[in-house]
Amino acid sequence: LIIGFGISGRHSITVTTVASAGNIGEDGILSCTFEPDIKLSDIVIQWLKEGVLGLVHEFKEGKDELSEQDEMFRGRTAVFADQVIVGNASLRLKNVQLTDAGTYKCYIITSKGKGNANLEYKTGAFSMPEVNVDYNASSETLRCEAPRWFPQPTVVWASQVDQGANFSEVSNTSFELNSENVTMKVVSVLYNVTINNTYSCMIENDIAKATGDIKVTESEIKRRSHLQLLNSKAS
């Protein structure tokens, strides 16, 4: 969480951002909030990116003002106009690109004053893993698959019964480049699986951590998946 304060002749206002991550090819949100102001026509929201000459986005007098927008963001940005009234200046970024990563500044002007805060935006690919029993294998085998990751993640297996055990000798992980030549499909196979146990396939890079659990008993198979973005720090 980053909290910024204004620094000019006018009063300063508090602006708060949250570091976040974008999943390439999908839409992302750059979070920013500020002290709401009753005089809506005075509210100006500017999004800037370090190293980019033009603006990422500008909203003033109740509408988008995109004449100064940088080419790389053309047609890809929007603020939530209905939420500006409650102090939400968050930016929606469509079709996130790898090159969108960097330091952004959320700069706010209201009738009460000015303020800004920076935001670190990471980009990559992350997806939920699915763990299945591989019935084609000669022994009891689990197969963990996740369709899109970047940068290349690490894959670690764990089990509820053998807590702390190292499964690297009885597992095999491969990374297959997807058709867009950036993201990769992750496939990890775990051998010599015992029944009545819960196994977890944990996939992690510097952007996200995802876990796929599978519980195999004689009567049923239960699955659960969970994905968590890392470094969501507010400022």
Partner: antibody
């Protein structure tokens, strides 16, 4: 000095509609949101809806969805609130107010009585 | 939808004494909270916004505090004109919900 002047008291039949006006003076009308807040006899304040002329958007409380319509005429600096399918429990004082997000100026209120 | 609650429902205080009115939100509203005063037969009046900022013309005996979900309006030395109903209101999210109010009456 900002002033919000509302239309006069009304008596309405159940099932009919009401339309209350609110004329603003003393500041740029479209620079602010205008909200409607009602107060039933002996009860608290209830936010109904808000319009943001500068954004061209309106918001209603879920409770009034489909029954309330708010409009704003920038040329006359007047906001309107129409409530349809009136029932006895809509008997209240209806206030127009400048805002959100919070409300710094209020109209004098319009008493609407719904009775057969 | 955020639910606002206020306590007590009625507060009896003597003139010159201090009064503390409580407001609670069902989830965090950050600093997006306002207080209003309403006297019988009159429209409400904005007292405080942004938890602690007094509106224009509001005397400094009115003070707001708190953050997140718990808020307090303190009136340091009650004057006869301070009696009436007090409402808190959140503006973190649409819809703009008011609390049920606290009636401040003369003891």
């Amino acid at each position: 000095q900002v002033q919000l002047v509302q239309s006069g008291a009304e008596v309405k039949k159940p099932g009919s509609s009401m339309k209350v006006s609110c004329k603003a003076s003393g500041d740029t009308f479209s620079s602010y949101a205008i909200s409607w807040v009602r107060q039933a006899p002996g009860q608290g304040l209830e936010w109904m809806a808000g319009i943001i002329p500068v954004f061209g958007t309106a918001h209603n409380a879920q409770k009034f969805q489909g029954r309330v319509t708010i409009t704003a005429d920038k040329s006359t600096s007047t906001a309107y609130m129409e409530l349809s399918s009136l029932r006895s429990e809509d008997t209240a004082v209806y206030y127009c107010t400048r805002g959100g997000p919070y409300f710094d100026y209020w109209g004098q209120g319009t008493l609407v009585t719904v009775s057969s | 939808e955020i639910v606002m609650t206020q306590s007590p429902a009625t507060l009896s205080v003597s003139p010159g004494e201090r009064a503390a009115l409580s407001c609670r939100a069902s989830q965090s509203v950050s600093s997006n909270l306002a207080w209003y005063q309403q006297k019988p037969g009159q429209a409400p009046r904005l007292l405080i916004y942004g938890v602690s900022t007094r509106a224009t013309g509001i005397p400094d005996r009115f003070n707001g505090s708190g953050s997140g979900t718990e808020f307090t309006l303190t009136i340091s030395s009650l004057q006869s004109e301070d009696f009436g109903a007090y409402y808190c209101q959140q503006y973190k999210k649409w819809p703009f919900i008011f609390g049920p109010g606290t009636k401040l009456e003369i003891k």
